[in-house]
Interface confidence: low
């Protein structure tokens, strides 16, 4: 009778084990072990027991002890079970960003590991078990589908293997994959709202605002604002699930024409964009041209108004004939035209909007000097000792200098209150002088004495 000890062993892959083969007869003809494993016999006293060290056990094996006794040959098997943890536990790679509401398939692959009967694969979100299945196949594959939710944002998904050898008196061996950190996002199907001027004048600034609601996580959203090739640098303010990006846009003559304004929002691996056209225009104020800004009375004056080639102008409220960018009028300068304003208004249509620009110029008419009866009476009669104010107003542009003298020396105090005396009586020569010339007028002052009353 042949026996073996131990009859059943569980050992780590590559490990060694001592196996004792015994026989019941004292003088066996033969006692040994049959195994493909590397073996070493340990020398023991006696003939009916042998101990072998079996090494580098890589897989399950059934070494067999045999003995040949006088009463016949017999055998006994020992069962070696090898255990080892998986060589690879891995989640199939996935895009780090996943839209909320999408079904996400987690796939865990496990290579190796034994005994398979004791090997379980567990898919986890954080510490929460999503699925637990025995490892089947090589590589073993376990999948589960997760409906992506907002609160999954930042969650770590992983795969764990459990080799449970506690029933065999050993421990629970765990291997965990590298985690997959899920970044969830919501990018609404609606494009961002873009508010901007439809038209913008060269060398001015405009404000552009781009906004979108219903984003998650809003802090991860990237906003790109551009006018043509010009990247704008917005100030972004965030709400709970919204943002508003505000930028100033400056345009130059190089930008003139129709430009594309773009607002794009990128979140996760998706983007939404809104396009709008902005017409950049150049529209200088119209030009008012006077033949000369300063003319003498009686001179012919041409007033011209010139504007942008596509503009329509009116000069002093009168539209150009025919309607267009130029208008003019002719006049003979009179003193009444001095200080007269000539106003030109130009209107340009840009992308369906009417833009208005104005310019005004003033005409200076040089005339005079003038001394007439109305403003400088030729005869004054005043009672002696009365209080009087001699008045004589000379007109002209530029304003003339006025002097009234009696006998070339005695001045009449124009515009001053005086007490009438005999000395005041007489004929005065009033002379008004300016760059435009000189005029004279005689003024007689009569004084009534009390004796004549």
């Amino acid at each position: 009778q042949t026996s073996v000890s131990p009859s059943k062993v569980i050992l780590p892959r590559g490990g060694s084990v001592l196996v004792t083969c015994s026989t019941s007869c004292d003088q066996p003809k033969l006692l040994g072990i049959e195994t493909p494993l590397p073996k070493k016999e340990l020398l023991l006293p006696g003939n009916n027991r042998k101990v072998y060290e079996l090494s580098n056990v890589q897989e399950d094996s059934q070494p067999m002890c045999y003995s040949n006794c006088p009463d016949g040959q017999s055998t006994a098997k020992t069962f070696l079970t090898v255990y080892w943890t998986p060589e690879r536990v891995e989640l199939a790679p996935l895009p780090s960003w996943q839209p909320v509401g999408k079904n996400l398939t987690l796939r865990c692959q496990v290579e190796g590991g034994a005994p398979r009967a004791n090997l379980t694969v567990v898919l986890l979100r954080g510490e929460k078990e999503l699925k637990r299945e025995p490892a089947v196949g090589e590589p073993a594959e376990v999948t589960t589908t997760v409906l992506v939710r907002r609160d999954h944002h930042g969650a770590n998904f992983s795969c764990r293997t459990e080799l449970d050898l506690r029933p065999q008196g050993l421990e629970l061996f765990e291997n965990t994959s590298a985690p997959y950190q899920l970044q969830t996002f919501v990018l609404p199907a609606t494009p961002p709202q873009l508010v901007s001027p439809r038209v913008l004048e060269v060398d001015t600034q405009g404000t552009v605002v781009c906004s979108l609601d219903g984003l998650f996580p809003v802090s991860e959203a990237q906003v790109h604002l551009a006018l043509g090739d010009q990247r704008l640098n917005p100030t972004v303010t965030y709400g709970n699930d919204s943002f508003s990006a505000k930028a100033s846009v400056s345009v130059t003559a190089e930008d003139e024409g129709t430009q594309r304004l773009t607002c794009a929002v990128i979140l996760g691996n998706q983007s939404q964009e809104t396009l709008q056209t902005v017409t950049i225009y150049s529209f200088p104020a119209p030009n008012v041209i006077l033949t000369k800004p300063e003319v003498s009375e009686g001179t012919e004056v041409t007033v011209k108004c010139e504007a942008h080639p596509r503009a329509k102008v009116t000069l002093n409220g009168v539209p150009a004939q025919p309607l267009g960018p130029r208008a003019q009028l002719l006049l003979k300068a009179t003193p009444e035209d001095n200080g007269r304003s000539f106003s030109c208004s130009a209107t340009l249509e840009v992308a369906g909007q009417l833009i208005h620009k104005n310019q005004t110029r003033e005409l200076r008419v040089l005339y005079g000097p003038r001394l007439d009866e109305r403003d400088c009476p030729g005869n004054w009669t005043w009672p002696e000792n009365s209080q009087q104010t001699p008045m004589c107003q000379a007109w002209g542009n530029p304003l003339p200098e006025l002097k009234c003298l009696k006998d070339g020396t005695f001045p009449l105090p124009i515009g001053e209150s005086v007490t009438v005396t005999r000395d005041l009586e007489g004929t005065y020569l009033c002379r008004a002088r300016s760059t435009q010339g000189e005029v004279t007028r005689k003024v007689t002052v009569n004084v009534l004495s009390p004796r004549y009353e």
């Epitope: 895009p95 950190q181 990237q222 794009a264 990128i266 691996n269």
Partner: antibody, heavy 120, light 107 residues
């Protein structure tokens, strides 16, 4: 100026090991995912590995280096590392470290690269 | 893994020319494609990301567009400093993968 400077390259025999370092400056290093990308002589670009931001970062590797290379970071030192073991002749390349910006793996800042030569 | 197939592998052009480089993804990558420029002995530089967004500091003569799984990098008027190798890259999923490169040479 935002900068990444690699070091640690050199000549090594097949089966040998090497540790590459990448020093970051002028940006908040701990906020960014970081990556290693390599370029074999006269060839194109190949992504090697990345490491996430956060207190307990996670890592990912190209199949060609999995189990042999280990990426790590030290936020206190503003440094990124690549431990390369069991090196093969086909690992000969210029290794670049790069900063990752969203969305996905866009590499916006690159170091000048360090040459690793594996030859017997 | 997603394959990125770039064409042509090289081209000759003159200063002032309009240059177009194409990249095709083996599967849908949404708009997640970046373009890089690399000069000999230097590190690559990011030009475009998310198919059409110009990275800050990149001249406006560079632009990108998408049509399905085909992506295009256009240089509207080639400048002397633009002679280099250009790579596309998908940043839709891990692992990120690059095109084999297009070398733009002086005619």
């Amino acid at each position: 100026e935002v900068q990444l400077v690699e070091s640690g390259g050199g000549l090594v025999k097949p089966g040998g090991s090497l540790r590459l370092s990448c020093a970051a400056s002028e940006f908040t290093f701990s906020d960014y995912f970081m990556s290693w990308i390599r370029q074999a002589p006269g060839k194109g670009l190949e992504w090697v590995s990345y490491i996430s931001s956060g207190r307990s970062p996670y890592t990912n590797y190209a199949d060609s280096v999995k189990g042999r290379f280990t990426i790590s970071r030290d936020n206190a030192k503003n440094s990124l590392y690549l431990q390369m073991n069991s090196l093969r002749v086909e690992d000969t390349a210029v290794y670049f470290c790069a900063r990752v910006r969203g969305p996905g793996d866009v590499f916006d800042i690159w170091g000048q690269g360090t040459l690793v030569t594996v030859s017997s | 893994d997603i394959q990125m197939t770039q064409s042509p592998s090289s081209l000759s052009a003159s200063v002032g020319d309009r240059v177009t480089i194409t990249c095709r993804a083996s599967q849908d990558v949404n708009t997640a494609v970046a373009w890089y420029q690399q000069k000999p002995g230097k590190a690559p530089k990011l030009l475009i990301y998310s198919a059409s967004f110009l990275y800050s500091g990149v001249p406006s003569r560079f632009s990108g567009s998408r049509s399905g799984t085909d992506f295009t990098l256009t240089i509207s008027s080639l400048q002397p400093e633009d002679f280099a190798t250009y790579y596309c890259q998908q940043h839709y999923t891990t692992p990120p993968t690059f095109g084999q490169g297009t070398k733009v040479e002086i005619k």
